[in-house]
């Protein structure tokens, strides 16, 4: 339906409130690098422009899309030039050309130092002094950190976030009551941002058919009693949500995703038993709590698929005139009897009755070509179980940081060209699979753990191809999404690498060690063994096992001696000479 | 298997209406096509209404607009409500069904029928 005024349209349904922060959002993840005070001036000017498009749709300027009036005020700022360098060339593009060179200049690895949290008392006075300025600068600050961040998700964030300060800041031990609170926040957030950031580099990379075929899996899990032709009104209204928000379109992107809200919650009944709860809630919460809700049971007696997909005349008929339609059809019903399974195995396990069907619909006997074709589906099966449960068993054995270290080796290993930073974030997030998976029953495992590992090689692939440096990376990254993962576990050690030249620079430490927290002291120390890879990638684990354990006595000797800074100095050359002979 | 039952059928006088019934079992056939054929006596089976999986319908010309088809999945069943009726709708009428994503035409695309259930239009 179209309206006079975009603009007007999306404040009158979203609300001042919310309006004013999806904008912020949007500024702050498209300019990452804007002092605060530039943006919340920006978004002061929009809101009354929008407030007078309200009163009167037919005012000057009221009719031009939402993309033409925020690049037009992107395009005021006046360092952009200088701030952005080529990214203000944007700014002579017409719409929509202009829009897709500021999605094409997000940056995912900003050069923004890191969030340092103050005193609880200086966060608690800053809190009640300008409560909303206080939320703004949280909207900004994880926005221009998080260029993809799901925008309607952040609003709910930044509802949490104020209601942990409302009631911390009031009790009698506020850094005990929101220390916790802001860590869950943190970790949530970054949880989120990476989920959100599969979901972009899903529609941008792969199109809209790879965020389908992810999103008829996902919801038929969740919601196996629902029909087929259900589950794809809610992919096709999931789907539209989220190229919105991938494609900055934040005020649309909220907009349809509290119509979703709405539709499921009106229509409960023919779509799960469980979400009943969530609809009970205020809108944000609603959203998120649709988004997160569990599996609903399975129906008792679904009949075996063979004989409607393998076994019936019309396969080929079916897949020859709906092809798209069919597939989805059958992931559906692979899907909602298969919660046990991993979206990515499902999606692989479709892939493989296509690519069955696309041969043998194409032969002499197609029945007699594709009767076997689910016992194909065999291996793909065992594959990621087999592999869950190997990593479950040394995640259990080691213990996390031990095998966060042990993963650290392994893709140093596979590809040891990227750079040490991103081996060391991606394999630390990696070995948190461990604790946030083995621990379930079976049937929860590879979910979890395919899922999970997905969302973290995709910071891989998105940190990588802002600077490509292994040929073997972008082949895992660009070929097939549903084969990142497999693709990955498949490399070996990388052959044709030239080890890295010895710089007794990278091994030298200093008393600052000692004052670092435990994990800051562990990414000290993973760099560190990752750098030893690179330098003897042929190093065997017990080589480098011995070499870490010396490093953890040398500084924890050190950390405990009068004079920490002459300790590093004097015991850290002999460290590097002893790791170096341990190595030769 | 899908065992179809019809219901509904009787006499009824020209311009009045009637509700016919296809009840489904054996497995859910919400993703299945379903269809409306009837026979007259002495006359070949022919294509009343269609429905797919998405409860997009199609009609032979000669019912369009007097008769409706419909499904209740929940209730694994399927319904063609006939009004404004003549005497030439006058015919024993088959519910089948198939796992075909569109809906079919042709009585030998569907492999599951019916017993059928007679309509009389007479006064």
């Known amino acids: 339906d179209t309206h006079k005024s975009e603009v007007a349209h999306r404040f009158k349904d979203l609300g001042e409130e919310h309006f004013k922060g999806l904008v912020l959002v949007a500024f702050s993840q498209y300019l990452q690098q804007c002092p605060f005070e530039e943006h919340v001036k920006l978004v002061n000017e929009v809101t009354e422009f929008a407030k007078t498009c309200v009163a009167d749709e037919s005012a000057e300027n009221c009719d031009k899309s939402l993309h033409t009036l925020f690049g037009d005020k992107l395009c005021t700022v006046a360092t952009l030039r200088e701030t952005y360098g080529e990214m203000a060339d944007c700014c002579a593009k017409q719409e929509p050309e202009r829009n897709e060179c500021f999605l094409q200049h997000k940056d995912d690895n900003p050069n923004l130092p890191p969030l340092v949290r103050p005193e609880v008392d200086v966060m608690c006075t800053a809190f009640h002094d300008n409560e909303a300025t206080f939320l703004k600068k949280y909207l900004y600050e994880v926005a221009r950190r998080h260029p993809y961040f799901y925008a309607p998700e952040l609003l709910f964030f930044a509802a949490r976030y104020k209601a942990a300060f409302a009631e911390c800041c009031q009790a009698a031990d506020k850094a005990a009551c929101l220390l916790p609170k802001l860590d869950e926040l943190r970790d949530e957030g970054k949880a989120s941002s990476a989920k959100q950031r599969l979901k972009c580099a899903s529609l941008q990379k792969f199109g809209d058919r790879a965020f389908k075929a992810w999103a008829v899996a996902r919801l038929s899990q969740k919601f196996p009693k629902a029909e087929f032709a259900e589950v794809s009104k809610l992919v096709t209204d999931l789907t539209k949500v989220h190229t919105e928000c991938c494609h900055g379109d934040l005020l649309e992107c909220a907009d349809d995703r509290a119509d979703l809200a709405k539709y499921m919650c009106e229509n409960q009944d023919s779509i799960s038993s469980k979400l009943k709860e969530c609809c009970d809630k205020p809108l944000l919460e609603k959203s998120h709590c649709l988004a997160e809700v569990e599996n609903d049971e399975m129906p008792a007696d679904l009949p075996s698929l063979a004989a409607d997909y393998v076994e019936s005349k019309d396969v080929c008929k079916n897949y020859a005139e709906a092809k798209d339609v069919f597939l989805g059809m059958f992931l559906y019903e692979y899907a909602r009897r298969h919660p046990d399974y991993s979206v990515m195995l499902l999606l692989r396990l479709a892939k493989a009755y296509e690519a069955t069907l696309e041969k043998c619909c194409a032969a002499a006997d197609p029945h007699e070509c594709y009767a076997k074709v689910f016992d194909e589906f065999q291996p793909l099966v065992e594959e990621p179980q087999n592999l869950v449960k190997q990593n479950c068993e040394l995640f259990e054995q080691l213990g996390e940081y031990k095998f966060q270290n042990a993963l650290l080796v392994r893709y140093t290993k596979k590809v040891p060209q990227v750079s040490t930073p991103t081996l060391v974030e991606v394999s630390r997030n990696l070995g948190k699979v461990g604790a946030k998976c083995c621990k379930l029953p079976e049937a929860k495992r590879m979910p979890c753990a395919e899922d999970y590992l997905s969302v973290v090689l995709n910071r891989l692939c998105v940190l990588h191809e802002k600077t490509p440096v292994s040929e073997k990376v972008t082949k895992c990254c660009t070929e097939s999404l549903v084969n990142r993962r497999p693709c990955f576990s498949a490399l070996e050690l990388d052959e044709a690498y030239v080890p890295k030249a010895f710089n007794a620079e990278t091994f030298t430490f200093h008393a600052d060690m000692c004052t670092l927290s435990e994990k800051e002291k562990q990414v000290k120390k993973q760099t560190a063994l990752v750098e030893l890879v690179k330098h003897k990638p042929k190093a065997t684990k017990e080589q480098l096992k011995g070499v870490m354990d010396n490093f953890a006595a040398f500084v924890e000797k050190c950390c405990k001696a009068d004079d920490k800074e002459a300790c590093f100095a004097e015991e850290g050359p002999k460290f590097v000479a002893a790791s170096q002979a341990a190595l030769a | 298997q899908v065992q179809l039952v019809e219901s509904g059928g009787g006499l009824v006088k020209p311009g009045g209406s009637l509700r016919l019934s296809c009840a489904a079992s054996?497995?859910?056939?919400?993703?299945?096509?379903a269809a409306w054929f009837r026979q007259a006596p002495g006359k070949e089976r022919e294509f009343v209404s269609a429905i797919n999986w998405q409860k997009t319908a199609t009609y032979a010309d000669s019912v369009k607009g007097r008769f409706t088809i419909s499904r209740d999945n929940a209730k694994n069943s399927l319904y063609l409500q006939m009004n404004s009726l003549r005497a030439e709708d006058t015919a024993v009428y088959y519910c089948?069904?198939?796992?075909?994503?569109?809906?079919?035409?042709?009585?030998?695309?569907?492999?599951?029928w019916g017993q059928g259930t007679l309509v009389t239009v007479s006064s």
């Open positions: 054996g497995r859910p056939v919400s993703n299945y096509a």
């Open positions: 089948a069904a198939v796992f075909r994503v569109v809906a079919p035409k042709t009585q030998y695309d569907y492999d599951y």
